[in-house]
Interface confidence: low
């Protein structure tokens, strides 16, 4: 007589998480009499998935009516597939007895579950850094399957290449996670810059997921200071200005000191943005020259974003003839304050 064959026509089936999976199985003969059972895995630790005669398998239904006379189709449908359902499924024929005896197994069908990656979450450095410094951004996405995945980093639309990416675990798993770190060298124009982590996966059908981070959260642009004296007024008052330029973020405190003594303290607020996202601020101080016998040393002291204070000093010459003092005289400084074209 013809030898019984248990036919599982598909070596593998791939299903998106949440969908139903159909695992096909037919037998070549009705003889000998005995049940068909479905298992996940092989060997002694295998897991019973479906047995018509007994048990409760709410997510598993037979494709054909197994009670129908001369039925040779023992395919099953598993609903609401999750990554945990991945594995190799075997259709096994038993000979009726007490107990039933395993007669023959199909070759097995490997069920792989396509699970979408979670939305990428991008995190930046804990503390701000200044231009020229390298900062790291991290991108994480979880729960995807199969393992193959592509992750790219962009800064303002340009792909970054100083990137390190790991997919875990290295071995076989029901689902995987990806973690990538991108190193970005900051420039002073990065207040308006953005880094994007882009994840492409077979489950996304060509529409990658993106996570973003604004470099404004990571950058500090230190201010430029310039102290200048305007022309002497008729009432013997000198107007001295402290120009604080090209700084970010806006958190800034300015203190005027006259001969080392605090004269006035101001906090920057509601400043208009420069084109590059930085801020400028000008503070004025009126000095009554006639109230001083000696030259007055004025200091503009700026504390920016919790950093150590930066000072710029200027001496108002009381001995000089007031009316002859030139307008817009720049304070002496340790370095040039000009910018080339900005």
């Amino acid at each position: 007589e013809e030898e019984l064959q248990v036919i599982q026509p598909e070596k593998s089936v791939s299903v998106a998480a949440g969908d139903s999976a159909t695992l096909n199985c037919t037998v070549s003969s009705l003889i000998p009499v005995g049940p068909i059972q479905w298992f996940r895995g092989a060997g002694p630790g295998r897991e019973l998935i479906y047995n018509l005669k007994e048990g409760h398998f709410p997510r598993v239904t037979p494709v054909s009516d197994p009670t129908k006379r001369n039925n040779m189709d023992f395919s099953i449908r598993i609903s609401n597939i999750t990554p945990a359902d991945a594995g190799t499924y075997y259709c096994v024929k038993f000979r009726k007895g007490s107990p039933d005896v395993e007669l023959k197994s199909g070759a097995g069908t490997e069920l792989s579950v396509r699970a979408k990656p979670s939305a990428p979450v991008v995190s930046g450095p804990a503390v701000r850094a200044t231009a020229e410094h390298t900062v790291s951004f991290t991108c994480e996405s979880h729960g995807f399957s199969p393992r193959d995945i592509t992750l790219k980093w962009f800064k303002n639309g340009n792909e970054l290449s100083d990137v390190q990416t790991n997919v875990d675990p290295a071995g076989k798993s029901v689902s995987y996670s990806i973690r990538s770190t991108a190193r970005v060298v900051l420039t002073r124009r990065d207040v308006h810059s953005q880094v994007i982590c882009e994840v492409a996966h077979v489950t996304l059908q060509g529409d990658p997921l993106r996570g973003t981070a604004n470099l404004s959260e990571a950058i500090r642009v230190p201010p430029f200071l310039e102290v200048t004296q305007q022309s002497m007024r008729a009432d013997n008052q000198v107007n001295v200005t402290c120009q604080v330029t090209k700084f970010y973020p806006q958190r800034l405190q300015l203190t005027w000191l006259e001969n080392g003594n605090v004269s006035r303290t101001e906090m920057a607020s509601a400043l208009p943005e420069n084109k590059d996202g930085t801020y400028n601020w000008t503070s004025w101080l009126l000095v009554n020259v006639s109230a001083h016998r000696d030259d007055v040393k004025l200091t503009c002291q700026v504390e920016h974003d919790g950093q150590p204070a930066v000072n710029k000093s200027f001496s108002v010459k009381v001995s000089a003839h007031p009316k002859e003092q030139g307008s817009n005289t720049a304070a002496e400084n340790t370095g040039t304050n000009e910018r080339n074209i900005y």
Epitope: K155, G157, N158
Partner: antibody, heavy 116, light 110 residues
Framework: QSVEESGGRLVTPGTPLTLTCTVS????????MHWVRQAPGKGLEWIGI?????ATSYATWAKGQFTISKTSTTVDLKITSPTTEDTATYFC?????????????WGPGTLVTVSL | QIVMTQTPFSVSAVVGGTVTIKCQAS??????LAWYQQKPGQRPKLLIY???TLASGVSSRFKGSGSGTEFTLTISGVESADAATYYC????????????FGGGTEVVVK
């Protein structure tokens, strides 16, 4: 405010050569500096930058072939192992205060000829 | 990496006429673009930065426009002194770039 290159000469292939850019009227602690070259009859080719803090970046083709360094008033470009294709006029140019943007002060250039 | 492509390679102009030079960036560079003029045997000179801002001392006959990936330099009322090679340059970023300059456009004035 000006920059001027020096050190260009005729060298044989493989002989290292260092070009110097001397700046005046401004401080290298306030401005990034670039090196740009131009082969005879060809266009401008950016080589690299040295930032105010001393960090450097190079064009993809220039990495390993050139080294940029600086002192308080000079910026050096070392051509590690010149080939005939490095024959060009080499310019240094002042960039922006603390990063990269445009070049508004250029030196007159210094000619390097690499020949056997 | 950002690649700058300039067209045409060479252009002829008549005195009093208008010349248009185009520059294309392979990526969106916003307004971070400059134009330079270089006469034979001389150093380059900055004409325009931030795509449309005239550099100090440059004639208003030079006009820059565009943003993103397409940029134009227009020279109106061409003079014989405008004969030179013009280069565009992206000021956006220098990580992983081959060259920040376009290939150049020679302007010949007749």
């Amino acid at each position: 405010q000006s920059v001027e290159e020096s050190g260009g000469r005729l060298v044989t292939p493989g002989t290292p050569l260092t070009l110097t850019c001397t700046v005046s009227g401004f401080s290298l602690s306030n401005y990034a500096m670039h090196w740009v070259r131009q082969a005879p009859g060809k266009g401008l080719e950016w080589i690299g930058i040295i930032y105010t803090g001393g960090a450097t970046s190079y064009a993809t083709w220039a990495k390993g072939q050139f080294t940029i360094s600086k002192t308080s008033t000079t910026v050096d470009l070392k051509i590690t192992s010149p080939t005939t294709e490095d024959t060009a006029t080499y310019f240094c140019a002042r960039g922006d205060r603390d990063g990269y943007a445009y070049f508004n002060i250029w030196g007159p250039g210094t000619l390097v000829t690499v020949s056997l | 990496q950002i690649v700058m492509t300039q067209t045409p390679f060479s252009v002829s102009a008549v005195v009093g006429g208008t010349v248009t030079i185009k520059c294309q960036a392979s990526h969106n560079i916003g307004s971070w673009l400059a134009w330079y003029q270089q006469k034979p045997g001389q150093r380059p000179k900055l004409l325009i930065y931030d795509a449309s801002t005239l550099a100090s001392g440059v004639s208003s006959r030079f006009k820059g426009s565009g943003s993103g990936t397409e940029f134009t330099l227009t020279i109106s009322g061409v003079e014989s002194a405008d004969a030179a090679t013009y280069y565009c340059q992206q000021g956006y970023g220098i990580s992983y770039v081959h060259n920040v300059f376009g290939g150049g456009t020679e302007v010949v004035v007749k």
